[in-house]
């Protein structure tokens, strides 16, 4: 109720002689701060004096002074909430009741705490899970109702007296709720741990033994078995007898059933610890074991491999791979059931023994067409020789052999002819299904392996064919050797390298790209007139009159071809310059007079300069010089100069006469 002081602390604390006790404690006074605190041992209330009697272990006064003999007992609390105590060392006669007498300004309270001090260190307590099964991880717990800051301890785990190598986790609690030290060990027990003793040992800080607790492990496990066989090597021949015995070395709980298994399958009506096999056959070869069950589950023995030996059975041949491609590798495998395994093999190709081949596998690194046929084998072991089986067929496939392209036409072939070619071959596996031709063209194939080229081109130099099954084999190209008239005839200027100027030495070449046959004749022509019959046309000193359109022709036995017309352009400086006057060379003053500089030039005149009779240049640069209105003073001789990229030319003087008008004459 509200008239009580509120305390929190463990109800009872445990310790042993010479150890210490640490008492975690909290409180809340009814009013104000704590003014006086007395720790009694086994306090008794005296009704006469209305006070408590008993041994005073600790006393604090208002002035805060503590008697020097109270060093063993320490009040670690404060004036309003902490009442923690420490007794170090603690003695056997400290057992009993501790009384905490608390006084504030107006209120008093006695709080009781039980202290249990034993003569010797008390043992910890081991806690185990209700059931332990083999290989299932469990947690072992060792608990000691003791912990004190002034007295360090440790808990160690032992198995059959030997420290356990698994890491334990130790935890301590010193709280108002509980005081303990705990060690937890995670452990995966095996069936062999069944019945073994586990110890939790309490030690002081130096590892000195203080006390311990022990438990015996009860590890549930499936039966553990051993199998024995006669004969011990488990190798027999057909008709022999075999005995197998099953022994249980451990089972927890006790076993309930027994059975035998061959190759993982249970043998019917075999439920005893002995298995007797009489007059064994090869089919009884296999892996045997016994199985014994208990409530945990079935346990199995190790397997015994029983081998029943017999002579090889009729063999079969496996080919990797058929059909085989010529040049590839092939492996033959002789398959025959036998025990022991065959030690010798005899191989046959098309019924004939293959010399030097005695292994299970025959490897041919590079297959050739003649390797095709039937392969069979015979296997042999210590018990006898097997029969030869039916064998396997090897099919060797290869591209068509000895492919040739044949021209069916009479030679020579001329441009424009129709040419027929055929594609021949010697042998093929599988059969030829199609043909290819190089180069590709819009040609017809009237029948398989025949090519017809209509209007053969001059540049159809070579043709090759391929006969194809799964692969194509190409024949060597065959030359058509097509004859044709000269091609790409053109006129080429050899010299000069730059433009042609009047007076230059000029050479023109008649070029053509090809001709078959090679023997040719040349013809040069200008404006329909024959000029020469050489490959070159030469001019020692070209003149403007040589300019014009030139063509050359090239002939062979097939035909003749003309070049495109080629224009010969001769560049020359302005020539034949003259000044013409309009309307004439006599003009009345005030009218208009136009002087024109006429010339012959290639390229045309680009710049004109006009001069008077004094050779004074006039600031006019056009072909025409217009004088308007013309003055009498303009009478005189004029000349012009024309310039192009080749050079200059000048005209002779031309005289302009400007006469007075009737008006001027009348004024005079």
């Amino acid at each position: 109720d509200s008239s009580k002081w509120v305390f929190e602390h463990p109800e009872t604390l445990y310790a042993w002689e010479g150890a210490c006790v640490w008492i975690p404690c909290t409180y809340r006074a009814l009013d104000g701060d704590l003014e006086s605190f007395i720790l009694f041992h086994n306090p008794e209330y005296n009704k006469n004096t209305s006070k408590f009697d008993g041994t005073r272990l600790y006393e604090s006064t208002k002035d805060g002074k503590v008697p020097s003999e109270q060093k063993r007992v320490q009040f670690l609390g404060d004036k309003n909430k902490n009442c923690t105590l420490s007794i170090h060392p603690v003695h056997l006669n400290d057992s009993g009741q501790l009384g905490l007498r608390m006084e504030s300004k107006t209120e008093k309270w006695m709080e009781r705490i039980h202290l249990n001090v034993s003569e010797r260190p008390f043992p910890p307590h081991i806690q185990l899970p209700p059931e332990i099964q083999e290989s299932q991880e469990v947690t072992l717990t060792c608990l000691l109702n003791f912990s004190c800051y002034g007295y360090p301890i440790q808990l160690q785990w032992l198995l059959e007296g030997v420290p356990m190598r698994q890491a334990a986790v130790t935890s301590t609690s010193l709280t108002i709720k509980s005081v303990f030290t705990r060690s937890e060990l995670k452990f995966s027990p095996q069936w062999s741990h069944h019945g073994k003793i586990v110890t939790c040992q309490l030690q002081d800080a130096d590892g000195k033994f203080l006390s311990n607790d022990t438990v015996q492990l009860n590890v549930k496990h499936t039966p553990k078995l051993e199998i024995k066989v006669t004969p011990s090597d488990a190798i027999v021949r057909e008709g022999d007898s075999v005995t197998m015995t099953c022994e249980v070395s451990s089972s927890n709980p006790e076993y309930t059933t027994v059975s035998w298994l061959k190759d993982g399958t249970s043998l019917k009506k075999q439920n005893t610890f002995t298995l007797n096999l009489r007059e064994v056959t090869k089919d009884q070869s296999g892996k045997y074991c016994c199985q014994v069950s208990n409530d945990v589950g079935p346990g199995r023995s190790e397997e015994v491999f029983l081998q029943v030996q017999y002579a090889p059975e009729p063999s079969t041949v496996q080919i990797l791979h058929s059909p085989a491609v010529e040049g590839s590798q092939v492996e033959f495998l002789c398959m025959s059931l036998a025990n022991p395994l065959p030690t010798n093999y005899t191989w046959y190709h098309n019924g004939k023994e293959m010399q030097g081949r005695t292994e299970e596998k025959v490897h041919i690194p590079k297959i050739l067409p003649w390797h095709a046929g039937t392969y069979s084998c015979v296997a042999e072991n210590i018990l006898g020789t097997g029969q030869r089986g039916p064998g396997a067929e090897l099919d060797v496939q290869y591209p068509p052999k000895k492919v040739t392209t044949v021209i069916q036409n009479p030679m020579p072939i001329r441009e424009g002819d129709t040419v027929t070619l055929s594609c021949n071959y010697n042998s093929s596996n599988p059969s030829v299904t199609r043909y290819e031709w190089k180069p590709h063209g819009a040609w017809e194939e009237p029948s398989l392996g025949v090519l017809k080229i209509q209007n053969v081109g001059w540049d159809n130099t070579t043709i090759a064919c391929a006969a194809c099954n799964s692969w194509c084999s190409w024949a060597s190209p065959v030359a058509l050797n097509v004859q044709y008239a000269p091609r790409d005839v053109r006129v080429r200027k050899i010299k000069p390298l730059s433009e042609i100027h009047s007076g230059n030495s000029v050479s023109l070449q008649c070029d053509f790209s090809s001709s078959h046959p090679k023997e040719v004749q040349f013809f040069w022509e200008k404006n329909g007139r024959l000029l020469g019959k050489e490959s070159q046309l030469n001019f020692d000193s070209i003149s403007p009159e040589d300019a014009g359109s030139y063509s050359c022709w090239v002939n062979n036995s097939i035909g003749q071809t003309a070049s495109k017309a080629w224009t010969l352009e001769v560049l020359y400086a302005p020539r034949r310059l003259r000044v013409s006057m309009s309307p004439g060379d006599q003009v009345m003053e005030g009218k208009s007079a136009t002087l024109t500089c006429e010339s012959d030039a290639n390229p045309p005149v680009s710049h004109y300069t006009w001069f008077d009779w004094n050779n004074q240049s006039l600031p006019y640069h056009s072909q025409k010089l217009r004088l308007e209105p013309v003055k009498v003073q303009h009478s005189g001789a004029y000349w012009c100069q024309g310039t192009n990229s080749v050079g200059k030319g000048r005209s002779p003087l031309s005289t302009l006469t400007v006469y007075y008008s009737p008006e001027t004459i009348g004024r005079r």
């Epitope: 710049h607 300069t609 008077d612 004094n614 050779n615 004074q616 240049s617 006039l618 600031p619 006019y620 640069h621 056009s622 217009r626 004088l627 308007e628 209105p629 013309v630 003055k631 009498v632 003073q633 303009h634 310039t643």
Partner: antibody, heavy 118, light 116 residues
Framework: EVKLVESGGGLVLPGGSLKISCAAS????????MYWIRQTPDKRLEWVAY????????FYPDSVKGRFTVSRDNAKNTLYLQMSRLQSEDTAMYYC???????????WGQGTSVTVSS | QPVLTQSSSASFSLGASAKLTCTLS???????IGWYQQQPLKPPKYVME???????HTGDGIPDRFSGSSSGADRYLSISNIQPEDEATYIC?????????????FGGGTKVTVLG
Amino acid sequence: EVKLVESGGGLVLPGGSLKISCAASGFTFSDYYMYWIRQTPDKRLEWVAYISNTGYSTFYPDSVKGRFTVSRDNAKNTLYLQMSRLQSEDTAMYYCARHGILYAMDYWGQGTSVTVSS
Amino acid sequence: QPVLTQSSSASFSLGASAKLTCTLSSQYSTYTIGWYQQQPLKPPKYVMELKHDGSRHTGDGIPDRFSGSSSGADRYLSISNIQPEDEATYICGVGDTIKEQFMYVFGGGTKVTVLG
């Protein structure tokens, strides 16, 4: 009456550019060759550009070649002088003039002043 | 290129006759020149075109007092009965084409002062 009127002059920084114009009237502009002539502060006359009636031929003295460009628009009866990379020595009064029939300039404009200074 | 030489100034009494000279460099002695008049604060004005034989073409609005003549490389501009409005600078000029490049050169000008 033949009339030539220049415009576009002004103050320009060294290295700068300026385009001046000359509007012609009173004659058939497309028949005549035209000049630009400048008069320096010391009153000397210097020919700076010459263009044919069609605009096909142009001539310049070495002092302005590559910096000045003369052009004409016969449809607008206008003569132009584009001046670039101007120098202080280009400071002058710029006149346009018509070339007479043979040897001389028979009509001159009033001029436009160009000052090149920083 | 041709070079034109003129005396820098000349003074004449009102009503007197004046004769100004423009000399061409010797190899250009037959060349025709142009005479121009520039009154103060005005543009140059065409006076006449003068040939080496003395024949000339005179500009519009030029009074009959102005005439021209030639002697060798010298070209003369004559003014009879000189008037105050004739006070001006008189400049000669000549054009030429060298290596297909046209050029035009001016003389330094003669400054004419009319006294009285």
